[in-house]
């Protein structure tokens, strides 16, 4: 791993829970500089493996709302606009970090949690399984 | 919004920075019980809009390593295995939360940061055949 020289201006870490419990500033800094994150918002409809977006809400989680993609078809849309079952629509999944209130209902105490979300769908060539 | 009844066992929040600064337990709880995140690991190669995965490392960020998708082609792979430029390979992007060390190099003090990552690629019908 990379060793980081410690900044002498760091907050005190003599807590008995350190290093498991850290201080986090919730004022979000947005690093998305050159592109518009809303730009790709129509891909779910224009893709050859289109998807629907479902709202997943949980007030005990931060962010409380996460959108989950569900592929519309088993196959993919061909040039004629029909579903081609020789190809497969599959979800692209990503593990993301969220904050879970812990203990529950506490406004200022959280635990990191890793969840798997489906972000969108892509069209893949199927793996053919021949029955042995 | 949803009002959450406060748990009387919550940590003390009489900090002058509250509610902007919260305590976070970094012992990650993994909610990915039912599915194998590695399951979709070959989609990048089998997709009609294939992508490569590039390692993005930043020791000042948590998680320090994020894998970013980079579409291989401008067009999409057709049934003959050739690139069809009448279709567009595009990245599926997602805004995710990460923790940024703040002040820099501090092991126990972070700020939430929102970054846009490319998770994979999908094949879309173009709105225009050339950049409009």
């Amino acid at each position: 791993g990379i060793t980081i020289p410690r900044n002498p201006g760091c907050p005190n870490s003599e807590d008995k829970n350190f290093p498991r419990t850290v201080m986090v500033n919730l004022n979000i800094h947005n690093r998305n500089t050159n592109t518009n994150p809303k730009r790709s918002s129509d891909y779910y409809n224009r893709s050859t493996s289109p998807w629907n977006l479902h709202r997943n809400e949980d007030p005990e989680r931060y962010p409380s709302v996460i959108w989950e993609a569900k592929c519309r078809h088993l196959g993919c849309i061909n040039a004629d606009g029909n579903v081609d079952y020789h190809m497969n629509s599959v979800p692209i999944q990503q593990e993301i970090l969220v904050l879970r209130r812990e203990p529950p209902h506490c406004p200022n105490s959280f635990r990191l949690e890793k969840i798997l979300v489906s972000v969108g769908c892509t069209c893949v060539t199927p793996i053919v399984h021949h029955v042995a | 919004g949803i009002t959450i009844p406060r748990n009387p066992g919550c940590p003390n929040s009489e900090d002058k920075n509250f509610p902007r600064t919260v305590m976070v337990n970094l012992n990650i709880h993994n909610r990915n019980t039912n599915t194998n995140p590695k399951r979709s690991s070959d989609y990048y190669n089998r997709s009609t809009s294939p992508w490569n995965l590039h390692r993005n490392e930043d020791p000042e960020r948590y998680p320090s390593v994020i894998w970013e998708a980079k579409c291989r082609h401008l067009g999409c792979i057709n049934a003959d295995g050739n690139v069809d430029y009448h279709m567009n390979s595009v990245p599926i992007q997602q805004e995710i939360l990460v923790l940024r060390r703040e002040p820099p190099h501090c092991p126990n003090s972070f700020r939430l940061e929102k970054i846009l990552v490319s998770v994979g690629c999908t094949c879309v019908t173009p709105i225009v055949h050339h950049v409009a």
Epitope: - | K70, C71, R72, V90, V124, H129
Partner: nanobody
């Protein structure tokens, strides 16, 4: 912050050739395509050519097809535009830029551009 520096323009006679270069730095890890664009006096900026960083596959505007060739050098993070059989209507300021959505990129997706490089074709 993305930085784009174009070079290689100038004045050339119709039928002549020029080679433009573009050095790009600060690109996103996920950057997968680069493009050349141009803006003639009194006209809107238009797409000229695009290239995939990974495959090297290219796409050209109909007006430059078979005359212009785009290439890239991944190690140097540079792209090039070889322009042959130049015509007076190719006169414009030429720009390069990252294409964050490949061929789906639109002009209004961009927040900033480089300075561009003047190409003048005299008859």
């Amino acid at each position: 912050q993305v930085q784009l520096v174009e070079s290689g323009g100038g004045l050339v006679q119709a039928g002549g050739s020029l080679r433009l270069s573009c050095a790009a730095s600060g690109l996103a890890v996920s950057s997968y395509a680069m493009g050349w664009f141009r803006q003639a006096p009194g006209k809107e900026r238009e797409f000229v050519a695009a290239i995939s960083w990974i495959s090297g596959g290219t796409k050209y505007a109909d007006s430059v097809k078979d005359r212009f060739t785009m290439s890239r050098d991944n190690a140097k993070k540079q792209v090039y535009l070889e322009m042959n059989s130049l015509k007076p209507e190719d006169t414009a300021v030429y720009y390069c830029n990252d294409m964050p959505y490949g061929l789906d990129t639109r002009m209004d997706d961009y927040k900033y551009w480089g300075q561009g490089i003047q190409v003048t074709v005299s008859s």
